[in-house]
């Protein structure tokens, strides 16, 4: 029959070439002379001339060694023609399969592979995967089947074999316990890929395993005991820098320290922060310390990390003895602001009050006093006793110096320390009103018509406070009552002035005496302009001119 079975040809054949592979034969050759030819890639088209055929015998020839990795299969067509060139058979399919030889070594996809794994992990933890390829066949043969192995490990601590590799997938896993970044931060593995499923050619590469940090080391105080000296009253004062060492990766959350005052700070006087670069604990005063109340504080500070510990670790504690240094403190007036009630107008030399300061220092220091600010100059202060006396007339109604009945004075106390310190106090004198002002009418000038005059209403004011004010009483004096009447309204806070007899146009003085509820009398002259007019007027009309 005009057929041929698939032909298998090993790659890399050594010849001699041309090498006879198979014979094409048409049974029509009994009747006529047959000439054979082949076509297709590898024959008459690229790659041309790999195969040929003996024209008269039909022997299929291989002209050169084959490379499976280049072309694994050739598909050719065989032709049979008679002497006159007529085709005697249909073209025949010729399949030539190139069989694999183990002519390629495995190749790793990288010279160096990099992976990482957390320190302290258990066996079985995957680290990384390495890959090698082999161009040879891995389907029908083992030529291209790669098996992975670890050839060596550096360093060999704590065990020779810390890692293993899956022979088929190239996945590297931890096999032994004891990965400790603080001892071995990186391992270098020489890995092998061997074809023939481990029995053939070998190639090597490097796998670098970085051991990642876990917070498996506690920060430790070094030293653990500190002594510090702090002046009393200083706020925000740096007391001490506490130093820790931590074996974990610097500047990582497993290394960065967190400080906590565990004890000894009952009054919440201290605070501690972490220095961002040095990792030191900076102990500072949150509030001023008081030497006189407590001259020594013993603090206990615990240190941990920003990151939680991955295992149970003992925490380190430091002891800081803080010695409070005495400072000459300023005298303090007690109270800082003193309110004293005093009658206005008391006689000169009359005592107002005693205002003294206390010195926080325990030594019996001498305190001297003086007035710092006395706007009206009404007071004096005894430098030894702190006795304040009147040297001027205290006037409640003095609007320049008195606000809301209060006269404010600032006093100073100075101790005899070296150097001396001063403290100030505020003396608030609440001036008690006395009936020292009579009632006054407003306005004091009026204009009124001499015909059908309008009543003039005058407001009464009194600088004093109740009860030294309304109700007021009015009385006309010096014969003013002949032409005028004066009556206080029902509320007692205004006076109504009326013209009761005709007066010619002119200016007149009306003598009005007003007295308050405390019978304090004030005589006031009202200047009344009388005009020739009817009813209401504001200014006298000029003389009438006809024309």
């Amino acid at each position: 029959d005009w057929v041929v079975a698939p032909i298998s040809v090993p790659e890399n054949g050594k010849g001699p070439f041309p090498q006879r592979l198979n014979q094409l034969k048409s049974n029509k050759d009994r009747d006529t002379k047959i000439f054979y030819s082949i076509t297709g890639p590898g024959a008459d088209s690229p790659p041309e001339g790999v195969f040929a055929v003996e024209k008269e015998t039909g022997w299929l020839l291989l002209n050169k060694p084959l490379d499976r990795e280049e072309i694994a299969k050739y598909e050719l067509f065989g032709h049979a023609v008679s002497e006159n060139g007529a085709s005697v058979e249909d073209p025949m399919n010729i399949s030539i399969i190139v069989t694999d030889q183990n002519d390629h070594k495995p190749k790793f996809t990288q010279d160096t592979f990099r992976g990482s794994v957390l320190e302290g992990v258990l066996p079985g933890t995957s680290v990384m995967q390495v890959t090698a390829t082999d161009e040879d066949d891995a389907i029908y043969t083992y030529n291209g089947v790669v098996a992975y192995s670890i050839h060596s490990q550096e360093p060999k601590d704590p065990h020779d074999l810390m890692f293993t590799i899956h022979r088929s997938t190239g996945t590297i896993s931890v096999i032994s316990s004891g990965l400790d970044r603080e001892k071995v931060p990186e391992y270098t593995l020489t890995i092998q890929a061997t074809d023939m499923d481990g029995d053939g050619s070998t190639t090597t590469a490097v796998a670098v395993v970085e051991i990642l940090d876990a917070n498996d080391n506690a920060p430790m105080f070094d030293p653990q005991k500190y002594e510090a000296h702090v002046p009393e009253n200083a706020v925000g004062h740096e007391v001490q820098r506490l130093t820790v060492t931590d074996l974990d990766a610097p500047n990582s959350p497993a290394w960065r320290a967190t400080y906590l005052i565990m004890g000894g700070d009952d009054g919440d006087h201290f605070t501690i922060t972490t220095h961002p670069e040095s990792n030191q604990g900076i102990l500072t005063t949150r509030k001023g310390l008081d030497f006189e109340a407590k001259n020594q504080h013993t603090l206990y500070v615990e240190v941990t990390n920003e990151a939680p510990f991955v295992l149970k670790l003992p925490t380190s504690t430091a002891t800081i003895v803080v010695h409070v240094e005495d400072v000459n403190e300023a005298p303090v007036f007690v109270p800082p602001s003193k309110v004293v009630e005093v009658q206005e107008g008391i006689p000169t030399g009359e005592p107002v009050c005693v205002y003294t300061a206390e010195d926080p220092d325990k030594e019996n220091q001498k305190i001297s006093y003086r007035i710092l600010r006395d706007p009206a100059g009404w007071l004096a202060m005894d430098p030894d006793s702190g006795q304040v006396t009147a040297v001027g007339t205290l006037d409640r109604e003095d609007e320049q110096f008195v606000r809301n009945n209060i006269y404010e004075v600032m006093v100073l106390a100075m101790d005899n320390g070296s150097p001396p310190t001063t403290g100030t106090g505020t003396l608030l004198l609440t001036l008690i009103d006395v009936n020292d002002h009579g009632p006054v009418p407003e306005p004091r000038q009026i204009t009124i018509c001499n015909q059908s005059p309008v009543r003039q209403v005058l407001n009464i004011t009194d600088k004093d406070l109740s009860p030294h004010t309304s109700p007021f009483q009015a009385q006309l004096t010096d014969d003013s009552d002949i032409y005028w009447t004066a009556e206080v309204n029902e509320e007692g806070d205004t006076v109504v002035l009326s013209l009761k007899k005709f007066l010619k146009q002119d200016t007149y003085d009306v003598h009005l005496s007003l007295s308050d509820h405390g019978n304090k009398e004030q005589l006031t002259v009202i200047r009344a302009t009388v005009c020739d007019c009817h009813g209401h007027v504001e200014t006298c009309p000029g003389p009438w001119k006809g024309g």
Epitope: L122, H166, D216, V310
Partner: antibody, heavy 117, light 111 residues
């Protein structure tokens, strides 16, 4: 001599708790992962739990997850297994064993845990 | 159902040789050369007799040997002796959180 010695086994009612201990000597305890392996009466070996040398990493078999807790105190060279919510099927001899990097060696002599009402 | 498969029992006469197989998968026995074998006498703790397929710890008789082919490992005991009568367990490393697998055990009877 390398040695592991378990203790703490006994009879406990279902739902109860027990704490097993394993004292190690003769080797650098903190360098090795440790495991608990149990063997029910007449049955094979069953891996229960493991802990890394530092104690920072732990694994559990699905059958005990959430009920058992493995821990270690390297300063005392001691391994522990806290067993809570015990069931009848937890009845077994419990062995502690050191993982040598691909195999278990040595093993303790075992401690019997019986869960029964 | 154990992860690694062993015959439930084997037997042999004194002086004979026997082999116990341990079959796993391409992710345990087939993937790593970390197959170990343990001997356990009744009422006693398991004892390591082979590690890394065929390595004997000191003190273990050279009558015990191991091999591996593909996904199956084997323990061979030559010159059987009465004291060899015990249960034998194979074990393999595997990657993952259950990093060790045990076989169901094989009871060896010395006739």
């Amino acid at each position: 001599e390398v040695q592991l010695l378990e203790s703490g086994g006994g009879l406990v009612q279902p739902g109860g708790s027990l704490r097993l201990s394993c004292a190690a000597s003769g080797f650098t305890f903190s360098s090795y992962a440790m495991s608990w392996v149990r063997q029910a009466p007449g049955k094979g070996l069953e891996w229960v739990s493991a802990i890394s040398g530092s104690g920072g990493s732990t694994y559990y078999a699905d059958s005990v997850k959430g009920r058992f807790t493995i821990s270690r105190d390297n300063s005392k060279n001691t391994l522990y297994l806290q067993m809570n919510s015990l069931r009848a099927e937890d009845t077994a001899v419990y062995y502690c064993a050191s993982w040598g990097g691909g195999w278990f060696d040595p093993w303790g002599q075992g401690t019997m845990v019986t869960v029964s009402s | 159902q154990s992860a690694l498969t062993q015959p439930a029992s084997v037997s042999g006469s004194p002086g004979q040789s026997i082999t116990i197989s341990c079959t796993g998968t391409s992710n345990d026995v087939g993937a790593y050369n970390y197959v170990s074998w343990y001997q356990q006498h009744p009422g006693k703790a398991p004892k390591l007799i082979l590690s890394e397929v065929n390595k004997r710890p000191s003190g273990v008789s050279n009558r015990f040997s191991g091999s591996k082919s593909g996904n199956t490992a084997s323990l061979s005991i030559s010159g059987l002796q009465a004291e060899d009568e015990a249960d034998y367990y194979c074990s393999s490393f595997t990657s993952g959180k259950t990093f060790v697998l045990f076989g169901g055990g094989t009871k060896l009877t010395v006739l």
